[in-house]
Interface confidence: medium
């Protein structure tokens, strides 16, 4: 059998006449910046070139004794996990190392910088197909080391992250921080987060997704033969390396934002126990386990879309929050949640020629987080329409006016303390799914794009007793992209997306009574890209949807027992 | 990357006197910041990563790191250049007492410095 | 216990070039700048520049400028010094030094052997 | 560039005697002045550093002072292992420099 966490990542396996093998990663390079490697280890032999940089502290006390198979310990095994002929992930891709992390598994954050810079040169002077970083490292949150991460990421460049091994939020440490950075957090066999000692994977918002990071084969450099079972962060950045080196492959135009929309829409949903996580956290942290798509083709049709949550905005008065969509996607919505329930809602507004999404605190609130809803949808024009309170009692309603374009999502925003839950609750006239409908003491916004076929329709699910959690799916073939409450009242926490799924969280029963004032309705736009389905059928026509899970039938014939060599 | 525009001692000697040499604020009056690693143990006082303004060019880089080098050397004080960044980001990493950063953060073109820290295998 | 060990004496032709090589042993090479010192014949001590190994920054003294490269080889622990157009007046011991570092204190504590290059037609 | 102006080039002293040697700088170098002891054939080695710091395993005759552009490297008591050339060294501004030497010769 293969070893569990390759059996992880590898997809349900589709029918075998769909499939061609595919070339496992062959036109990606993975860069490696960790320890000195044992190149000639038979896993990774010929498959890793060993760089001429170096940037590493001095070692650690007076009798520290240098062993080179110690010195070589992570990184050997790290690159066996990205493409070991064996334990590998992605065996076709090739590898280049540098050395920023020295024997005791230490480097710095300048040496780090250095490393990225040589990169960035190495790909000016020397232009090859995708480039995938991978940073199996981390150190205390760095400004410059996040803003190199960005511009390098800026330059076309995949880069790919430990979440840090410290128990604790991934926003604390770099480049786990750095939101350009693919982030992984680690999971073990169990799909339970990964305990390691007292501490453990990382997680919270920083993280992108989680990945197999405990008790991973790969090659171990006490000799050219030897298997060695490691555990961490940097493992399951590893994984995610060789599944986005895949990817490249299959797909060599990928941008960052589609490599990433991909990865998280691939990925296993719900699996992982969230209890492990501290209870202020488990909302923040992605419940997400890597795997590889089950063909190469086949997903361009889709709308892909992720959750994106702002930092938190702090207990003052007028503290805010603001969630930011990458360079290359779309903020189709916007939404924001309090622990406290003291906000004053949200709104889209224009930041540097980009929407964002910003979530007000309220006095006496705990603080509030933005939610963004970023998509991945080319060739859109999306504005922001607002509607000011409105007097009557009907409450506050905007739609989208313009011809062509569709709702995508609601805001408000409201300056009142406390909106009350004495106001009726405000109803959607039926017909009018194109329009925003709030609170008359808040302004609205709606999010009003037009694309190539793309088409929203709106889904309510309503509950008249009150509930802690009111949720509403989009179905099969459609994308969440909006998620509101309706109405904004004050009891309402907050709403945000769970991968297809609008979450609206309402305060504890008890304290909120059972009358009529506690209903609560959830709010789903749901779309879909007709232009982008109607691409894909094209492209489909004409290339057979090659599969990148018979690489691992192969696998099966290949991966020997005696090959285990555990230290 | 070599440092292209000769020795810097000439530059000591066309500033003014002691006391006025860097004291004029950054250009556009924004003030540069210092940032160090929040965990402690992790510190590497001593070598701080200079970060200049995003359209800085090379030999501006190299310019204020000598600018740097006369000024603190007008103080008693060594600093050693150990690399010119260009490329991802511009600036220079320099090896230098803290007692000078007060001074560096005032150099035109600087938009923040950062002190050096470990970063760990995961 | 740390060491710079230099290749072996050279006999160059004038217009020639010479690259010396400092292999250092017995401490992370990256750590410190490798220093270039030349001494000719009964002569004082002239610096020519440095390289700092972990990213390969050099400075070099405005004299030899035009004539000097340094590298490195991170893998074999190597710093080398290279002097084209050689002349005459550049007969002379090549001297590569380790430049320790520490609070305001900076100073010279390894010296390699030495290698001596004679240029003479 | 700095000049550093050693003196004397050269000394004939007695073992047991105190030897004083002078450095003086063109400018201001503060103390960012180290002292190299070298014997024929050999390399320099380091006695001092920052002005007035004796290197880690150099016998404590062995002193420096002086800031500024004055320096004095002094031997307090005069050995047989002591007669070679010593060097100044101002690592206060590229190019670093050198002084000419001074040869201690057995009287």
């Known amino acids: 059998s293969i070893p569990w966490n390759l059996e992880r990542i590898t997809p349900p396996r589709y029918r075998a006449d769909e499939y061609q093998p595919p070339d496992g990663g062959s036109l990606v390079e993975v860069y490696l910046l960790d320890t000195s490697i044992q190149s000639d280890h038979r896993e990774i032999e010929g498959r890793v070139m060993v760089t001429d940089f170096e940037n590493v502290p001095e070692e650690d006390g007076t009798r520290f004794h240098r062993q080179a198979s110690k010195c070589d310990s992570h990184g050997t095994h790290l690159a066996g996990v990205v493409s070991g002929r064996d334990a590998g992930v992605a065996k076709g891709a090739s590898m280049r190392s540098l050395r920023v992390l020295n024997c005791q598994g230490k480097g710095t954050v300048s040496g780090t910088l250095i490393g990225l810079e040589f990169i960035r040169k190495s790909q000016l002077v020397q232009p090859v197909g995708p480039l995938v970083v991978l940073l199996p490292l981390a150190g205390g949150y760095s400004r410059v080391l996040n803003a190199a991460c960005q511009r390098l990421a800026r330059a076309g460049v995949v880069l790919v992250t430990a979440a840090g091994n410290f128990r604790d939020d991934a926003c604390l440490y770099s480049p786990a921080s750095a939101p350009e950075v693919i982030t992984v957090g680690a999971t073990n066999a169990q799909d339970q987060p990964v305990t390691l000692g007292t501490l453990g994977t990382n997680f919270g918002r920083c993280v992108d997704l989680f990945a197999p990071g405990e008790d991973i084969i790969g090659a171990s450099s006490d000799c050219s033969t030897c298997f060695v079972s490691q555990s961490g962060t940097s493992q399951a950045a590893a994984h995610v390396a060789g599944i986005a080196a895949m990817m490249l492959s299959a797909e060599p135009e990928l941008t960052l934002a589609e490599l990433r929309q991909r990865l998280i829409h691939f990925s296993a949903k719900d699996v992982i126990n969230e209890a492990w996580f501290p209870e202020d956290q488990r909302v923040l942290t992605p419940n997400l386990v890597a795997a590889l798509p089950p063909s190469t083709h086949g997903a361009g049709w889709q709308l892909f879309c992720r959750t994106v949550w702002s930092a938190h905005s702090g207990p003052t008065r007028m503290a805010t929050a603001v969630a930011r969509c990458a360079p290359d996607e779309e903020l189709l919505s916007c939404s924001s949640f309090s622990r406290s329930g003291k906000r004053r809602g949200e709104r889209m507004e224009a930041q540097g020629g980009k929407l964002v999404c910003r979530a007000h605190n309220a006095f006496g609130g705990e603080g509030v987080y933005a939610i963004a809803r970023c998509c991945l949808l080319p060739q859109a024009n999306c504005s922001v329409h607002t509607a000011p309170p409105a007097e009557a009692s009907m409450g506050t309603r905007v739609h989208c006016h313009q011809q062509g374009h569709v709702l995508t999502g609601c805001s408000s925003h409201w300056e009142v303390e406390d909106l009350g839950t004495h106001k009726p609750p405000v109803l959607r006239p039926r017909g009018q799914p194109n329009q925003c409908v709030g609170h008359r003491e808040a302004s609205i916004h709606a999010s009003c794009c037009h694309a190539p076929g793309l088409e929203c329709k709106v889904k309510e699910h309503g509950i008249p007793a009150p509930q802690e959690q009111v949720t509403v799916a989009c179905e099969e073939g459609w994308t969440l992209t909006g998620c509101s409450a309706l109405p904004g009242t004050s009891h309402v926490l907050g709403a945000y997306a769970v991968d297809n799924t609008c979450v609206v969280r309402s305060r504890d029963v008890s304290t909120t009574g059972s009358t009529s004032e506690g209903a609560v309705t959830a709010v789903a736009i749901c779309c879909r890209s007709r232009h982008l389905a109607q691409a894909s059928q094209e492209l489909q026509g004409s290339t057979s949807g090659s599969g990148l899970n018979d690489i691992f039938e192969a696998q099966k014939i290949e991966w020997h027992e005696h090959h285990h060599h555990h230290h | 990357q070599e440092d292209e525009d000769g020795d810097y001692e000439e530059l000591v000697l066309a500033l003014r006197s002691e006391e006025d040499g860097l004291a004029e604020a950054p250009e556009h009056g924004t003030t540069a910041t210092f940032h160090r690693c929040a965990k402690d143990p992790w510190r590497l006082p001593g070598t701080y990563v200079v970060v200049l303004k995003e359209e800085t060019h090379l030999s501006q880089s190299e310019r204020t790191a000598r600018r740097l080098q006369a000024q603190a050397a007008r103080r008693g004080y060594l600093t050693k250049i150990l690399h010119v960044f260009h490329g991802l980001l511009p600036g220079f990493l320099v090896k230098m007492s803290g007692d000078l950063l007060e001074l560096a953060l005032k150099l035109p073109h600087v938009d923040y410095i950062e002190e050096d820290s470990s970063v760990f295998a995961q | 216990q740390v060491q710079l060990v230099q290749s072996g004496a050279e006999v160059k032709k004038p217009g020639a070039s010479v690259k010396v090589s400092c292999k250092a042993s017995?401490?992370?090479?990256?750590?410190?700048?490798i220093h270039w010192v030349r001494q000719a014949p009964g002569q004082g001590l002239e610096w020519m520049g440095y390289i700092n190994p972990s990213s390969t920054y050099t400075k070099f003294n405005q004299k030899f400028k035009d004539r000097v490269t340094m590298t490195r080889d991170t893998s074999i622990s190597t710093a080398y010094m290279e002097l084209s157009r050689l002349r005459s007046d550049d007969t002379a011991v090549y001297y590569c030094?380790?430049?320790?570092?520490?609070?305001?204190?900076?100073?010279?504590?390894?010296w390699g052997q030495g290698t001596t290059v004679t240029v003479s037609s | 560039d700095i000049v550093m102006t050693q003196s004397p080039s050269s000394l004939s002293a007695s073992v047991g005697d105190r030897v004083t040697i002078t450095c003086k700088a063109s400018?201001?170098?503060?103390?960012?002045v180290a002292w190299y002891q070298q014997k024929p054939g050999k390399s320099p080695k380091l006695l001092i550093y920052?002005?007035?710091n004796r290197y880690t395993g150099v016998p404590s005759r062995f002193s420096g002072s002086g800031s500024g552009t004055d320096f004095t490297l002094t031997i307090s008591s005069l050995q047989p292992e002591d007669f070679a050339t010593y060097f100044c060294?101002?690592?206060?501004?590229?190019?670093?420099?050198f002084g000419g030497g001074t040869k201690v010769e057995i009287k």
């Open positions: 030094a380790r430049e320790r570092i520490y609070s305001n204190y900076w100073f010279f504590d390894v």
């Open positions: 060294q101002q690592l206060s501004s590229y190019p670093y420099t």
């Open positions: 017995g401490y992370t090479f990256t750590g410190y700048t």
């Open positions: 920052s002005a007035s």
């Open positions: 400018q201001n170098v503060y103390t960012a």
